[in-house]
């Protein structure tokens, strides 16, 4: 599924996000556009090995099981599969797990350097929460 | 462009220990997940231990768990593999990759050229 972007920001304010660990609901959803462009389904190969899953791009060297990366940790205990559904529980539930490890958003690339410092609060404005 | 440059392999007998290092250098950015392959003659290039930024979190291939530490110097740029009680099937060409974040940019994977391992019985 390919969200829209104040369909997502429901979405994630919903399922919690909204200021969890600090983080306004505008990073998430700047984070989303710049890791899969709002699409669930988004994969990525990555030359280690790994590839990243779904709508938060999720690891899985460290976070999920996606039986094919060796050294996994699947430090979210959940199979990178559901990372890809249209039901973004998951992720959402992975994503906090990750951004309470100890580096904040900045364990999201895109974020880091598309979204952190920026007026993230424009990727909401004007949608119905 | 960010260069790695790993060091420290050699010939051990078994039993004998080793301290790989993996050295990356350039501007401007930061290691995020690192880690090592090895490459034995004749077969595929796997998996031995990697670390990530956040948390410090540790993955190791079941061959060397018990065995081998992966640590890293973030000061230094440098992410380092301490191989105990060496086995003859550790032998191997070692190889350090990186996943690199430039600041205000983009991120990429790079792959050193490699040491090579020897362990003799």
């Known amino acids: 599924k390919v969200f829209g972007r104040c369909e997502l920001a429901a979405a994630m304010k919903r399922h919690g996000l909204d200021n969890y660990r600090g983080y306004s609901l505008g990073n998430w959803v700047c984070a989303a556009k710049f890791e899969s462009n709002f699409n669930t389904q988004a994969t990525n190969r990555n030359t280690d090995g790994s590839t990243d899953y779904g709508i938060l791009q999720i690891n899985s060297r460290w976070w999920c099981n996606d039986g094919r990366t060796p050294g996994s940790r699947n430090l979210c205990n959940i199979p990178c599969s559901a990372l890809l559904s249209s039901d973004i529980t998951a992720s959402v539930n992975c994503a906090k797990k990750i951004v309470s490890d100890g580096n904040g958003m900045n364990a999201w690339v895109a974020w880091r350097n598309r979204c952190k410092g920026t007026d993230v609060q424009a990727w909401i404005r004007g949608c119905r929460l | 462009q960010v260069q790695l440059v790993e060091s420290g392999g050699g010939l051990v007998q078994a039993g004998g220990s080793l301290r790989l290092s993996c050295a990356a250098s350039?501007?401007?950015?930061?290691?995020?997940?690192v880690g090592w392959f090895r490459q034995a003659p004749g077969k595929e290039r796997e998996f031995v231990a990697a670390?990530?930024?956040?948390?410090?979190?540790?993955s190791y291939a079941d061959s060397v768990k018990g065995r081998f530490t992966i640590s890293r110097d973030n000061a230094k740029n440098t992410v380092y593999l301490q191989m105990n009680s060496l086995k003859p099937e550790d032998t191997a060409v070692y190889y350090c990759?990186?996943?690199?974040?430039?600041?205000?940019?983009?991120?990429?994977?790079?792959w050193g050229q490699g040491t090579q391992v020897t362990v003799s019985s």
């Open positions: 990759y990186a996943k690199i974040v430039y600041d205000q940019g983009p991120s990429y994977y790079y």
């Open positions: 350039g501007s401007s950015f930061s290691i995020y997940d």
């Open positions: 670390t990530i930024e956040t948390g410090g979190h540790t």
